[in-house]
């Protein structure tokens, strides 16, 4: 596969991953009430996210409440907020770096410098995926640990919410996409024959021998 194709595919995956990460960050479904027992009738389900918690009644009515105080939040929520927002912002920066290093743009002159910029974009996406993975795994670990802890009240036990799964899928896309961008940049530097062909200038007049100047051909 050509470096340009790797670049495009990598960027598409990173953009989808970025969107998924924004969605995971905003959704109030990082943890959901665990239905451990059918003996006790639970008329409502509780969803908890990084920014708000929602109570869904059995009637389907949903009421959400944004967290009032940052200081009142648990350590893992505060850390998850910071790291997830950090990952989203890093992906934003990575997008511009990747576009600047892309072969189809003219922000940076073609050559080793441009390939290095493209490589930096890929690395930033990889870092973004890793950065997002930390709060997702940390949060999931706490939820699972508390679920199996016999000292935790039954109504305070939660299961992993959809946002965590979306987040994991997003980090996978960011890391695969970032990897492809790095591969594309590496291919570009090590195998220039696989990159976009150079822009042709108008051919000069034939020489006396009738040969065209071959410098524009690979």
């Amino acid at each position: 596969m050509g470096s340009a194709a790797l670049e495009i595919l990598g960027l598409v995956l990173c953009l989808v991953g970025w969107g998924g990460l924004i969605l995971a960050c905003g959704l109030p479904m990082w943890q959901v009430t665990a239905f451990l027992d059918h003996n006790i009738v639970t008329a409502q389900t509780t969803w908890k996210g990084l920014w708000m918690s929602c109570v869904v009644q059995s009637t389907g009515h949903m009421q959400c409440k944004v967290y009032d105080s940052v200081l009142a939040l648990s350590t893992e929520v505060q850390a998850a907020r910071a790291l997830t927002v950090g990952a989203v912002l890093l992906a934003f920066v990575a997008l511009f770096v990747t576009l600047a290093g892309a072969q189809c743009t003219t922000c940076v002159a073609p050559g080793p410098a441009k390939a290095r910029v493209a490589l930096t974009g890929g690395v930033l996406y990889l870092l973004c995926g890793l950065l997002a993975l930390v709060p997702l795994c940390w949060f999931a670990n706490i939820v699972v640990r508390e679920f199996y802890d016999p000292s935790v009240p039954v109504s305070q036990k939660y299961e992993l919410g959809a946002a965590l799964y979306i987040g994991w899928a997003a980090t996978a896309l960011l890391m695969v996409g970032g990897g492809l961008l790095c591969c594309g940049a590496w291919v570009c530097t090590s195998r220039p024959d696989l990159s976009f062909p150079v822009k042709y200038s108008a051919p000069r007049r034939p020489t006396a021998t009738g040969d065209y100047d071959k410098k524009n051909y690979v």
């Epitope: 451990l36 027992d37 016999p150």
Partner: antibody
């Protein structure tokens, strides 16, 4: 295992009071801890619980927003900050070790009287 | 909230007699996952703090004499003292240790006849 409460006494309605509980004989940070109160009127009543590191706290509805349970694992001490006290908060307050949602070791109790 | 109702509230028995204390919960707290009944029994002797006797309806705490027997399931539970001793004079409480708010029964006062 030993838990010893302190800080009780007479207090006027609307005022604050802080109870302490010094624990020994076990690894304090390995256990949930709780406060349970007892009054002739209401009998035994669970007040609040706190998890190992203090990141999770649980309260009985009537004390929610008024009482704050906290712990200092370095000092093996449990606290109960009681604000906006009411006459119905008059009781003997017990500090208890709280594994598996049980109360397996209790202190001797400390009397809190809310009266004008 | 789960309401715990104890009966009788007072009991006077002779040494050697068998004592039965009942506890009824307003709803079942039998865990469908592990089939455990989250009910505990406590003993509070005069002038002392409560002491845990039994948890999970029938599991005795270490050091608790085997004359104390816990039984029952669903919403109906029983604490049986197979042979009353003078040192068993106390108030006995049941408690659901399933979920918050953890609730106690009003107590059964046990005295010697």
């Amino acid at each position: 295992v030993k838990v010893v409460e302190s800080g009780g006494g007479l207090v006027q309605p609307g005022r604050s009071m802080k109870l302490s509980c010094a624990a020994s004989g076990f690894t304090f940070s390995d256990y949930f801890m709780a406060w349970v109160r007892q009054s002739p009127k209401k009998g035994l009543e669970w007040v609040a619980s706190i998890n190992y590191g203090g990141s999770r706290t649980y309260y009985e509805d009537s004390v929610k927003g008024r009482f704050t349970i906290s712990r200092d694992n370095a000092k093996s001490t449990l606290y109960l900050q009681m604000n906006s006290l009411r006459s119905e908060d008059t009781a003997t307050y017990y500090c208890a070790r709280h594994p598996h949602r049980l109360f397996d070791y209790w202190g001797q109790g400390v009397m809190v009287t809310v009266s004008s | 909230d789960i309401v715990m109702t104890q009966s009788p509230s007072f009991l006077a028995v002779s040494v050697g007699e068998t004592v039965t204390i009942n506890c009824k919960s307003s709803q079942s707290f039998l865990s469908s996952g592990n089939q455990e009944n989250y009910l505990a029994w406590y003993q509070q002797k005069p002038g002392q703090s409560p002491k845990l006797l039994i948890h999970l309806a029938s599991t005795r705490e270490s050091g608790v004499p085997d004359r104390f027997i816990g039984s029952g399931s669903g919403t109906d539970f029983t604490l049986t003292i197979s042979s009353m001793q003078a040192e068993d004079v106390a108030i006995y409480y049941c408690q659901q240790h399933y979920d918050i708010p953890y609730t106690f029964g009003a107590g059964t006062k046990l005295e010697l006849k």
